[in-house]
């Protein structure tokens, strides 16, 4: 009998409000035994996969997706899904990345360290398990 897969979570380091040209890392988390994590952008047609998974805790695994130099075009909604044989999980909630001008002045808003909730996170559409592994022909239009 197939197990029910828990929904992944998504967070961003150092936060979800990133100065232009700075880096951001999306962190996806799921159960132990995930083979592939996928970070989706806005819709399923644009995504990145990774199999470089490590332990987040005894019961959780995580994967990291780094954008070295954030551009305005990187702003938008991101979410994670994962593949744990024999199926894909549901999507995580959406996380919204905001890109700000890097004025660096005292009035510029702080980033939100480790933010994974709050007003920038939107519920997913819950249309899940319709994905196929990238190796089965779904084309990846890479995020960065």
């Amino acid at each position: 009998q197939e197990e029910d897969l828990p929904r992944p979570s998504i967070s961003a380091e150092p936060g979800t409000v990133i100065p232009l040209g700075s880096h951001v890392t999306f962190v996806c988390r799921g159960p132990v035994g995930v083979q592939t994590f996928r970070l989706e952008r806005d819709s399923r047609s644009t995504y990145n996969d990774t199999e470089d998974v490590s332990q987040a805790s005894p019961s959780e695994s995580e994967a990291r997706f780094r954008i070295d130099s954030v551009r305005e075009g990187n702003a938008g909604l991101y979410r994670c899904i994962y593949y744990k044989p024999p199926k894909w999980s549901e999507q995580s909630d959406y996380l919204e990345l905001l890109v700000k001008e890097s004025s660096g002045g005292p009035d510029s808003p702080d980033t939100e360290p480790g933010s994974s909730a709050g007003p920038t996170q939107r519920p997913s559409d819950n249309s899940h398990n319709e994905h196929a592994p990238a190796s089965q022909g779904l084309k990846a239009e890479h995020l960065y």
């Epitope: 890392t25 132990v32 995930v34 996969d49 470089d52 998974v53 805790s57 005894p58 780094r66």
Partner: antibody, heavy 119, light 107 residues
Framework: EVQLVESGGGLVQPKGSLKLSCAAS????????MNWVRQAPGKGLEWVAR??????????YYADSVKDRFIISRDDSENMVYLQMNNLKTEDTAIYYC??????????WGQGTTLTVSS | DIQMTQSPASQSASLGESVTITCLAS??????LAWYQQKPGRSPQLLIY???SLADGVPSRFSGSGSGTKFSFKINSLQAEDFVSYYC?????????FGSGTKLEIK
């Protein structure tokens, strides 16, 4: 088909150096962490080193027995992983396997290359 | 470092029998445990990952169980090709330590 082909093994004198290579094909190399594992003659398996992907800053990790002597590296443009071994000791004599890490587990192993350290 | 204590070091069994190998971790590793099979002169092959998940193409007579610090690996209905060596490994934290191995021999 996933393939990992090691090369570069041979006979080296104690305190000598050698560089092992591993050519990867048949999978998306730059999304996988890679490892080296060794097996001394008639002995069990010993994990040696790991290198992560670009999103993880190509972080490297080593067994205590090889720390400060061995260096793992990778070339994503050539689908290659390397193990530079310096100040070799007789106890480094082993078969060295290049191993793919998928989802946190060692799922695919090369055929191995043999290193003999002897005077 | 996490120590992995695997037992027995060797075990004799007959064709068609079942055998169980155990692996104890020196600290909790959740289910970050794998089991490998190694045939003489060959590379190891992943059998079980995440303590209980069967790797692709592995026969269902192989199974794994356990979490935390105590893990078991079972082979049902032993076949001639199963009389080789088996290793456990923790992948919770580096260094990724292996158990010392179990050699299965035909009785």
């Amino acid at each position: 088909e996933v393939q990992l082909v090691e090369s570069g093994g041979g006979l080296v004198q104690p305190k000598g150096s050698l560089k092992l290579s591993c050519a990867a094909s048949g999978f998306s190399f730059n999304t996988h962490a890679m490892n080296w594992v060794r097996q001394a003659p008639g002995k069990g398996l010993e994990w040696v080193a790991r290198i992560r992907t670009k999103s993880n800053n190509y972080a490297t990790y080593y067994a205590d027995s090889v720390k400060d002597r061995f260096i793992i590296s990778r070339d994503d443009s050539e689908n290659m992983v390397y193990l530079q071994m310096n100040n070799l000791k007789t106890e480094d004599t082993a078969i060295y396997y290049c191993v793919r890490l998928r989802g946190g587990f060692l799922d695919y192993w090369g055929q191995g290359t043999t290193l003999t350290v002897s005077s | 470092d996490i120590q992995m204590t695997q037992s027995p070091a060797s075990q004799s069994a007959s064709l068609g029998e079942s055998v169980t190998i155990t692996c104890l971790a020196s600290q909790t590793i959740g289910t970050w445990l794998a089991w490998y099979q190694q045939k003489p002169g060959r590379s190891p092959q992943l059998l079980i990952y995440a303590a209980t998940s069967l790797a692709d193409g592995v026969p269902s007579r192989f199974s794994g169980s356990g979490s935390g610090t105590k893990f078991s690996f079972k082979i049902n209905s032993l076949q001639a090709e199963d009389f080789v060596s088996y290793y456990c490994q923790q992948l919770y934290s580096t260094p990724f330590t292996f158990g010392s191995g179990t050699k299965l021999e035909i009785k």
